[in-house]
């Protein structure tokens, strides 16, 4: 096995994950590994001599740097915080706060805007991942109900009135709870799913 | 030869107190995260605290948190675990553990031999 | 907190075999993961990290694969030296977690 620094011709190298390209000496040596960077460069005799990243820096990949990547905390004015700090070998991971999605991305979350409010009768639609995109509001489905504007309240189910030895006053909907009475009131009392005594 | 030398091990009561040290040798103490993780007997491998090479990062396991405290000399190369309020439970072989190639956590590459803490009345 | 599960608790398996364990993480963890072998009275010694680097010395029968959620250790052909427990760790988070290992024996 040909361990680098060895010359090429065609100006490709075998592992081009670990090793790259050098066209001044058109050799191949190695790369650095995630979290170190190039102290010394390579040549036709010696190999890349790589560093560790100080403190509050990073290189995430197999890299030929002479620098690392300075850290950055998650910015909590643009809706970002923390979920793992920088190493050296990965950036601080943010995502977006909680009640927050991703409004603006480049390659990560720039930017978090507030979830929009799902109107009574609905919920939001449970996605995937936290945070990736605004809420989509779904109607609640028969059986249940949702009173309030909110992004994050989700469709109750409808009270049963016999579960607690009551009858219907009045059906639920969509947007209100089942009311129920006693049997022995002539009347449907003023109430959501209790019983008035 | 790379190194990591813990002592200060040894039999304490119940809410006693204990300073472990780790002398390291053989590599650039200065820039490596350094870890503490223990092991009670006949238990599994248990990480209590990390500290970054600057001092910036400072993170404790929950059950050690507000009683342990890490420190570091990059002077002395040494690594330090104050013990407070230690209970039965902290009962354990400690070892002194080097992040590979990080100044923040990561594998642990290089390990001591370990010392026996003894909480016991 | 990462929980780490590790499967099964103890094997025992003959010379030669091939032996797997798995660990699964309770969130993903990308890649950063290691797993340690430990021998009675010994401190633990690193054998693979970033989820599948092997570390400098360690014998190439020993291999790994899984990133995310799902990772399996494997032993191709189980030696005598082999013998000893072993641990899966996570390094993508505060709290560092192990999984609770996988004791191996021969049979």
């Known amino acids: 096995q040909v361990v680098p620094p060895y010359g090429s011709e065609n100006q490709t190298c075998r592992d081009q994950e670990k090793e790259y390209y050098e066209p001044r000496h058109r050799i191949c040596c190695s790369r650095c590994p995630p979290g170190t960077y190039v102290s010394a460069k390579c040549s036709r005799s010696r190999d890349t001599v790589c560093a560790t990243c100080a403190e509050n820096s990073y290189n995430e990949h197999w890299n030929y740097l002479t620098i690392c990547q300075l850290c950055r905390p998650c910015d909590p004015v643009m809706g970002l915080e923390e979920i793992a700090p920088c190493t050296s070998k990965r950036k601080t991971q943010c995502r977006c706060q909680p009640g927050m999605f991703c409004a603006a991305w480049a390659l990560e979350c720039t930017h978090c805007e507030l979830l929009s409010d799902c109107p009574p009768g609905t919920e939001a639609e449970l996605k995937d991942e936290v945070g990736k995109g605004n809420n989509h509001c779904v109607p609640c489905k028969a059986g249940h109900f949702q009173n309030t504007s909110s992004p994050s309240a989700r469709c109750q189910p409808h009270t049963r009135c016999e579960d607690q030895g009551l009858v219907e006053a009045a059906p639920g909907t969509a947007q209100s709870d089942t009311t129920c009475r006693n049997p022995s009131e002539s009347l449907p009392p003023e109430m959501s799913g209790t019983m008035l005594m | 030869e790379v190194q990591l030398v813990e002592s200060g091990g040894g039999l304490v009561k119940p809410g006693g107190s204990l300073r472990l040290s780790c002398a390291a040798s053989g590599f650039t103490f200065s820039s490596y995260c350094m870890n503490w993780v223990r092991q009670a007997p006949g238990k599994g491998l248990e990480w209590v605290s990390s500290i970054s090479t600057g001092n910036t990062y400072i993170y404790y396991s929950d059950s050690v948190k507000g009683r342990f405290t890490i420190s570091r000399d990059n002077a002395k190369n040494s690594l330090y675990l104050q013990m407070n309020s230690l209970r039965a439970e902290d009962t354990a072989v400690y070892y002194c553990?080097?992040?590979?190639?990080?100044?923040?956590?990561?594998?642990?590459?290089?390990w001591g031999q370990g010392t026996m803490v003894t909480v016991s009345s | 907190d990462i929980q780490m599960t590790q499967s099964p608790s103890s094997l025992s398996a003959s010379i030669g075999d091939r032996v797997t364990i798995t660990c699964q993480a309770s969130?993903?963890?990308?890649?950063?993961l290691s797993w340690y072998q430990q021998k009675p009275g010994k401190a633990p010694n690193l054998l693979i990290f970033?989820?599948?680097n092997l570390e400098t010395g360690v014998p190439s029968r020993f291999s790994e694969s899984g990133s995310g959620t799902d990772f399996s250790f494997t032993i191709t052909s189980l030696q005598p030296e082999d013998i000893a427990t072993y641990y899966c760790q996570q390094y993508y988070n505060v709290p560092l977690t192990f999984g609770g290992g996988t004791k191996v024996e021969i049979k």
């Open positions: 553990a080097r992040a590979r190639y990080n100044w923040n956590y990561d594998a642990f590459d290089i």
């Open positions: 970033d989820a599948s």
């Open positions: 969130q993903d963890i990308s890649n950063f």
